[in-house]
């Protein structure tokens, strides 16, 4: 795995411990919480990031709140089980043996049950809608400039292939970014849209996951884009299975 050789850190994930104990004395970085080796040339999976977040000291954790509006976080933060590739296991359980099924971005998609609950497969989230509302500005941003800047951001900062940014819609003050990535479209090495969306969400909140970089300074033709509300919605390849008695917290 590649990492900055000089000071042995992971540029794409600050929630890691790195040391020069890889093959040939190369820098190797492991995610906090899971101890799994991570590839520092690309984004770390959301599952490993959540696990690392939950392993942080409690007082540090309170500094990073779950997204209060996004439907993704109805159940708040939890300590997930990740598979050997760092993906969410289809079934998640807590310490009191309450279990539920999740999708590929770790969002609950069934009612909660007990240890007998079966989750046959990890259902893929293939469409993500990121809904941003920006703070008032002197005038509307130019749609083409905004579109280009957001596509550049996802390509360069999050290493997401441009073909997965399906659309950028804008009517002041609302910006919608649609990410689409079917199972058949995602090749080996492609960044997952769920991981890109999670890094973006944390960036927007001023909680960047990148090592040592300044926070996200989003500008459109020099004009700062300041976000006042962020909502992220997920659409799965197979619809979720909630009963009529679904909790309405």
């Amino acid at each position: 795995h590649t990492a900055a050789q000089d000071n042995c850190t992971c540029p794409t994930n600050k929630m890691t411990v790195c040391s020069p104990d890889g093959p040939g004395g190369r820098c190797q970085c492991r995610a906090l919480g899971s101890g799994m080796a991570v590839d520092c040339s690309t984004l770390t999976s959301k599952c490993l990031l959540l696990k690392a977040r939950m392993s942080a000291p409690k007082n540090a954790r309170t500094l990073v709140r779950p997204s209060e509006h996004a439907l993704v976080d109805n159940d708040g933060l939890y300590d997930p089980d990740c598979d050997p590739e760092g993906r969410f296991k289809a079934r998640q359980c807590n310490q009191t043996s309450v279990c539920w099924c999740v999708n590929s971005v770790g969002v609950r998609r069934t009612d909660k049950g007990d240890l007998s609950l079966r989750c046959d497969e990890l259902v893929r989230t293939h469409h993500i809608l990121i809904d941003l509302r920006h703070r008032p500005t002197a005038g509307a941003f130019n749609h083409s400039d905004l579109d280009a800047e957001l596509r550049r951001l996802f390509r360069e900062r999050y290493r997401l292939h441009p073909k997965f940014v399906a659309a950028v819609h804008y009517e002041q003050p609302t910006i919608q970014i649609e990410l689409r990535q079917n199972t058949s479209q995602k090749a080996a090495g492609d960044v997952d849209i769920g991981d890109a969306a999670y890094y973006f969400e944390r960036d927007i909140k001023g909680e960047s996951l990148f090592q040592g970089r300044g926070g996200l300074d989003l500008r459109v033709r020099g004009e700062p884009l300041q976000v006042e509300r962020t909502l992220i919605y997920y659409l799965d390849e197979i619809p979720p299975k909630f009963s009529m008695k679904r909790l309405t917290a």
Epitope: H69, A70, H127, L129, A167, E171, P173, Q176, Y233, Y234
Partner: antibody, heavy 119, light 110 residues
Framework: QLQLQESGPGLLKPSETLSLICTVS????????WSWIRQTPGKGLEWIGW???????NYNPSLMGRVTMSVDTSKNQFPLKVNSVTAADTAVYYC?????????????WGQGTMVTVSS | QSALTQPASVSGSPGQSITISCTGT?????????VSWYQQHPGKAPKLMIH???NRPSGVSNRFFGSKSGNTASLTISGLQAEDEADYYC??????????FGGGTKLTVL
């Protein structure tokens, strides 16, 4: 000029399923949030939920489990289904478009369709 | 029981100003600048008069003015006219990512 038109049966029996369709004409269904709102006789407005043109939905928790919204971009329609209706579901049902891609203000409304639930 | 509280009725004479209040909590009206106001004449669909607390859509008279202080939003109508007689509803985005409406206020022009 974008217009919305609600259609569907006006009379239902308790426990039946309410099915309404909102047809969008004079414009595209793309990228907007499309809401259903109802108004019970002599009472105020109640937000039922919205669907985005992508198919993503958000429902009022008080109706969760009974409501299903879908979208048919080829027909420029977004249907509403409410299961297991009771007399409390008797209302005028409106479909509406979110203003400028937002989900919390509605600039274009249908004329509304009255639905009565009675045995 | 509506999530947002409005007076059941208000009245005023032609030419006067009236104000309709809409009281919520810090989880809706107080927490966001996403308050809207609608006018509804009998047998008609609601019409958007104010959005984002104080913004008027094009075509809405500048006699309609929206504002907010704390957990209470207000709609002020100046130079009252006979055609302003209608029901008025406020709405607000909420912290649970839903939309709440007020119970409505009947405006009578005397």
């Amino acid at each position: 000029q974008l217009q919305l038109q609600e259609s569907g049966p006006g009379l239902l029996k308790p426990s039946e399923t309410l099915s309404l369709i909102c047809t969008v004409s004079g414009g595209s269904i793309s990228s907007h949030y499309w809401s259903w709102i109802r108004q019970t006789p002599g009472k105020g407005l109640e937000w039922i939920g919205w669907i985005h043109s992508s198919g993503i939905t958000n429902y009022n928790p008080s109706l969760m489990g009974r409501v299903t919204m879908s979208v048919d971009t080829s027909k420029n329609q977004f249907p509403l289904k409410v299961n297991s209706v009771t007399a409390a579901d008797t209302a005028v049902y409106y479909c509406a478009r979110g203003l400028r891609l937002t989900d919390d203000a509605f600039d274009i409304w249908g004329q509304g369709t009255m639905v009565t639930v009675s045995s | 029981q509506s999530a947002l509280t409005q007076p059941a009725s208000v009245s005023g004479s032609p030419g006067q100003s009236i104000t309709i209040s809409c009281t919520g909590t810090s989880s809706d009206v107080g927490g966001y600048n996403y308050v809207s106001w609608y006018q509804q004449h009998p047998g008609k669909a609601p019409k958007l008069m104010i959005h984002d607390v104080s913004n008027r859509p094009s075509g809405v008279s500048n006699r309609f003015f929206g504002s907010k202080s704390g957990n209470t939003a207000s709609l002020t109508i100046s130079g009252l006219q006979a055609e302003d007689e209608a029901d008025y509803y406020c709405s607000s985005y909420t912290s649970s990512n839903t939309l709440a409406f007020g119970g409505g206020t009947k405006l009578t022009v005397l």
